[in-house]
């Protein structure tokens, strides 16, 4: 056949749906790959074509879209499973084309099995909620498309294995569930269960979040260096190992970028010429603020390295801060019998 | 469309065991509960237990915690339930009942089990 | 155990009438109520899952209502394949619980 614009295996859209549930997956290539969406390639005369690859073979077969009660069809650019099966698992390919074009993407599907608490191999998405912030609601996600605006379903949102009912300050609202004040024993993985019905038969949708409690916004501060500080001196002789640790302390901040570095005289360690290592360690409190220490080490320093000057600074999107080390070149203890006689006025 | 069905009637003897299976298909079995309920001679219904085929998981009702035991065979997409120590007064049709969550969705025809000495 | 409690345990009414069964739980239930009818010599089938859910394939005569401790089978128009027992079950808290059941008859 002739040639094909081939945008590959799409590893970036790992796609995992639940086992015996419905799925629509929409062909990548109009969210992703081409500049112009289903409707106008439809409308230009091009046809989306579907086919598969099971899980460890190399066969590309069609989709068989004959199934008693249509578990598998297409409906413009979505791939519908009415349910999922186990073996649906794959990768599977939506190619558009007419006599003159050609274009596909290949994607993996990989249908999940669930346990009885809803736990599975599945990856699951994050939801920040800010500590006592006030009402912070979550929403079911993924499940628009499924039903019409006309179906009512009904939801029901589990914590763990446990039936929301009863919380003290959790909620169940429907799509949303609400957390009237969010504290870290809401942290955990939630799950919303979305029954509804079509055509005589019930279908599920499971949707698993986890929920994470941080730190609030109210409480952040700009980074604190808690070291280096002026209570403590890096006193050196010359050939000894200089070590000296920067600790901050960054409030946990959404999306704001932590950074620690060291200058000497006011240069980057990798511009200047003596041999110096950092070496970065980073700790999380449950509420995700976050402690990072840079340790400078210069193994054998000299009584130059002694003379520089040492900071260390930190940004993070509430400021930037500096501070420098207080490092000086240890004087040598006096020899008792010459330097304490003579300060003694012996002769 | 979802089909459960249950294994044929039953006459036990008081103090014996009796074990009813229920065969579904239709849906996949290990997604769902499978509930086992009774209903005596002209009474209501009652849950004695389910079991989550896809990881073993049962939950008992404590009347019945000792007496009953809830399995089911992935591999034939069978459960069962076994009642042991049987009396007079468990005489009842036993019902199936599949799940994806607690409501019971579709239900087996029913074995009627009868203890008589 | 939570207490299920219907009422009446039977009714005679006639066909198109409207029709109204209550369940009264002996706590709270949030909302995780069922209503399933059964036909003589027949397995229960769910007509109605949390609260007002309608189960696939019921028709819409059937609605439900309620919240907290008491809940609301309504049947707007009484039609002759009615007649049945039906019984709720609360599946707030284990174990599963369920109605003594309230039988309609035609008049």
């Known amino acids: 056949s002739e040639r094909c614009d081939d945008w590959g295996l799409d590893t970036m859209r790992q796609i995992q749906v639940f086992e015996d549930e419905p799925a629509r997956i929409k062909c990548p290539l109009f969210e992703h790959f081409l500049k112009f969406n289903y409707s106008t390639a439809h409308s230009a005369g091009l046809t989306l074509i579907w086919y598969w690859t099971r899980q460890d073979r190399d066969l590309e077969e069609p989709i068989n879209f004959r199934l008693p009660e249509n578990r598998i069809s297409k409906e413009k650019d979505v791939l519908w499973f009415r349910p999922t099966l186990l073996n649906d698992t794959g990768n599977y390919t939506c190619m558009l084309r007419n006599t003159t074009y050609c274009s596909k993407v290949a994607f993996p599907l990989e249908v999940v099995q669930k346990d009885s608490c809803f736990n599975s191999p599945m990856k699951l998405p994050v939801h920040k909620l800010y500590i006592e912030y006030g009402i912070q609601r979550i929403t079911c996600p993924n499940v628009d498309g499924y039903f019409p605006s006309s179906v009512k379903p009904t939801i029901t949102w589990y914590m763990g294995c446990y039936k929301i009912q009863n919380f003290n300050n959790v909620i169940p609202e429907g799509m949303n569930l609400s957390f009237l004040i969010a504290l870290i024993s809401n942290n955990g993985n939630y799950t919303c269960v979305v029954t509804y019905p079509e055509n005589g038969r019930t279908f599920h949708l499971t949707r698993t979040l986890t929920v994470k409690v941080v730190g609030s916004p109210k409480n952040a501060v700009p980074p604190v260096i808690h070291s280096p500080n002026d209570h403590v001196v890096y006193e050196k002789e010359p050939g000894e190992e200089l070590l000296i640790p920067c600790t901050v302390y960054f409030s946990f901040l959404m999306d704001s970028r932590n950074e620690v570095w060291w200058t000497i005289d006011g240069k980057k360690p990798d511009d200047i010429t003596i041999d110096v290592t950092i070496n970065e360690s980073i700790s999380h409190s449950r509420t995700e603020d976050e402690t990072r220490t840079q340790i400078l080490s210069i193994k054998k320093v000299t009584s130059e390295d002694l003379k520089r000057s040492y900071v260390c600074h930190a940004r993070s999107a509430k400021g930037e801060v500096a501070k420098a080390a207080k490092v000086k070149q240890k004087v040598p203890a006096p020899r008792y019998t010459v330097e304490l006689a003579c300060g003694f006025g012996a002769t | 469309q979802v089909q459960l069905v249950q294994s044929g009637a039953e006459v036990k003897k008081p103090g014996s065991s009796v074990k009813v299976s229920c065969k579904a298909s239709?849906?996949?079995?290990?997604?769902?509960?499978m509930n086992w309920v009774r209903q005596a001679p002209g009474k209501g219904l009652e849950w004695m237990g389910r079991?989550?085929?896809?990881?073993?998981?049962?939950h008992y009702a404590q009347k019945f915690q000792g007496r009953v035991t809830i399995t089911a065979d992935k591999s034939t997409s069978t459960a069962y339930m076994e009642l042991s120590s049987l009396r007079s007064e468990d005489t009842a049709v036993y019902y199936c009942?599949?799940?994806?969550?607690?409501?019971?969705?579709?239900w087996g025809q029913g074995t009627l089990v009868t203890v008589s000495s | 155990d939570i207490q299920m409690t219907q009422s009446p345990s039977s009714l005679s009414a006639s066909v198109g009438d409207r029709v109204t069964i209550t369940c009264s739980a002996s706590?709270?239930?949030?909302?995780?109520l069922n209503w399933y009818q059964q036909k003589p010599g027949k397995a229960p089938k769910l007509l109605i899952h949390?609260?007002?859910g309608l189960h696939a394939g019921v028709p819409s005569r059937f609605s439900g209502s309620g919240s907290g401790t008491d809940y609301t089978l309504t049947i707007s128009s009484l039609q002759p394949e009615d007649v049945a027992t039906y019984y709720c079950?609360?599946?707030?808290?284990?174990?599963?619980?369920f109605g003594g059941g309230t039988k309609v008859e035609i008049k």
């Open positions: 079950q609360q599946y707030s808290i284990l174990p599963w619980t």
């Open positions: 009942g599949e799940g994806y969550l607690d409501p019971m969705d579709y």
């Open positions: 239709g849906y996949t079995f290990t997604s769902s509960w």
């Open positions: 706590q709270g239930i949030n909302n995780y």
């Open positions: 079991i989550y085929p896809g990881d073993g998981q049962t």
């Open positions: 949390y609260t007002s």
